[in-house]
């Protein structure tokens, strides 16, 4: 015969644990029901009555089955350099990510705590490593035979056009100028662009990220002005 199903609250057998979505209440010494995501424990269980759950209030949430007395507060509103990629609901926290042209300089949990503008490489420098969601652009000087005449977070160094007759030799920040009507070989008009950072969680992710064990808040404090790094501009 199948064992009789115990209804919460109940005293567990010695050495056994409570079932899924139940917890052991030390005071009552009983297995009691957890509250579902979006709820919290309004009244804890006793030996004779089960947990009383209540819905989370506005701007608060619980993401897991729980028996917390109060729901967690959602993070503050996303700042001007962020976009809200997940709204605050009773079951999930707000998640803010950096808007295009910015990267996340500080994120220890979901979302971003501190956004910073992607570095722009000045003329004579090109993008060596594009920015990602969590890393800044790396600039490098244009090698001999290449140039960049833009201030950009996406442009790489391009080869000088090859002339039949050179009017003005190219340098790191300027293309060669030809005297003939058309050069022997020329790059297509317009700057060469690297793709914008794709919306991945991190530049360095593990194949199977482990579940986060701590609640996330995602508010941001303003960054002050930054002096330009080598080969870059703060504009």
């Amino acid at each position: 015969l199948p064992a009789q199903v115990a209804f919460t609250p109940y005293a567990p057998e010695p050495g056994s644990t409570c079932r899924l979505r139940e917890y052991y209440d030390q005071t009552a010494q009983m297995c009691c029901s957890k509250c579902s995501p979006g709820q919290h424990a309004k009244v804890f269980c006793t030996k004779t009555s089960d947990t009383v759950c209540d819905s989370c209030e506005d701007s608060t949430y619980t993401q897991l089955w729980n028996w917390v007395p109060e729901c967690l507060s959602c993070g503050s509103r996303c700042s001007s350099d962020q976009v809200e990629t997940q709204a605050c609901t009773r079951e999930q926290n707000r998640i803010c990510t950096c808007r295009p042209g910015w990267y996340c300089a500080l994120s220890k949990q979901e979302g971003c705590r501190l956004c910073a503008p992607l570095r722009k490489c000045r003329p004579g420098f090109g993008v060596a490593r594009p920015g990602t969601e969590t890393s800044d652009v790396v600039c490098k000087p244009c090698a001999p035979g290449t140039f960049s005449n833009t201030t950009s977070s996406t442009d790489i160094c391009r080869p000088h056009q090859i002339c039949n007759v050179v009017a003005i030799p190219g340098n790191a920040s300027m293309d060669a100028v030809c005297t003939s009507t058309s050069p022997t070989r020329s790059m297509a008009p317009g700057a060469v662009h690297l793709p914008q950072p794709v919306s991945t969680r991190s530049q360095h992710t593990q194949p199977t990220p482990e579940p986060s064990t701590a609640p996330s808040t995602s508010f941001l404090l303003p960054m002050g002005p930054s002096p330009p790094a080598e080969g870059s501009t703060g504009d």
């Epitope: 994120s107 220890k108 979901e110 705590r113 969680r201 990220p209 579940p211 303003p222 002050g224 930054s226």
Partner: antibody, heavy 120, light 106 residues
Framework: EVQLVESGGGLVQPGGSLRLSCAAS????????MGWVRQAPGKGLEWVGS???????YYANWAEGRFTISRDNSKNTLYLQMNSLRAEDTAVYYC??????????????WGQGTLVTVSS | DIQMTQSPSTLSASVGDRVTITCQAS??????LAWYQQKPGKAPKLLIY???KLASGVPSRFSGSGSGTEFTLTISSLQPDDFATYYC????????FGGGTKVEIK
């Protein structure tokens, strides 16, 4: 007692590999962001890399591609796999536990360190 | 990468002195800065985090201030146990340490 204990250091030839371990007692490592910091003899502190609770990792530029941080929850241990070692990687390697929360990265619990010597 | 510059590199002081160490970031790091104390052969010890918050168990004679790019660690009255090397650390994703300040006996 809450503590971190590093092991796995020693003498290794240039180009060789080594795996450092950081075993925790008194705390559950899976609840904390963790990191590795090294210190060459007579020099200052240098960050190697950090790992978030969800498994996402960040590395110093010089460590990218050569060093890997992993964790075994069942053993409550953090690892640092070091490949293609160079003489300049000679240092005491410390593991550190982050203060918690989602603010800045700071280490408020450190191991005693393990010495890695890269020499032929 | 953000560069952290500490000054001075060495500081000679006497017990009871008020000591100030500065740390400059090459770009704004908001308040995300920590200070550590390290003694020879020992692991670093966290003193201050988020620029001004005192870590657990740290004496109140240690204090921190600053935001953006300029930060200061102050020891209000130097004690014999305070002779050590002090490091600042910016706490954003790609962590960076200052070069250190050795506080020695005058």
């Amino acid at each position: 007692e809450v503590q971190l204990v590093e092991s796995g250091g020693g003498l290794v030839q240039p180009g060789g590999s080594l795996r450092l371990s950081c075993a925790a007692s008194g705390i559950d490592l899976s609840n904390y962001a963790m990191g590795w910091v090294r210190q060459a003899p007579g020099k200052g502190l240098e960050w190697v890399g950090s790992r978030r609770t969800d498994g996402i990792t960040y590395y110093a530029n010089w460590a990218e591609g050569r060093f890997t941080i992993s964790r075994d929850n069942s053993k409550n241990t953090l690892y640092l796999q070091m490949n293609s070692l160079r003489a300049e990687d000679t240092a005491v390697y410390y593991c550190g536990r982050d203060v918690g929360g989602d603010g800045g990265w700071y280490f408020n619990l450190w191991g005693q360190g393990t010495l890695v010597t890269v020499s032929s | 990468d953000i560069q952290m510059t500490q000054s001075p590199s060495t500081l000679s002081a006497s017990v009871g002195d008020r000591v100030t160490i500065t740390c400059q970031a090459s770009q704004s790091i908001n308040i995300y800065l920590a200070w550590y104390q390290q003694k020879p052969g020992k692991a670093p010890k966290l003193l201050i985090y988020d620029a001004s918050k005192l870590a657990s168990g740290v004496p109140s004679r240690f204090s921190g201030s600053g935001s953006g790019t300029e930060f200061t660690l102050t020891i209000s009255s130097l004690q014999p146990d305070d002779f050590a090397t002090y490091y600042c650390q910016q706490g954003i994703n790609n962590i960076g340490f200052g070069g250190g300040t050795k506080v020695e006996i005058k």
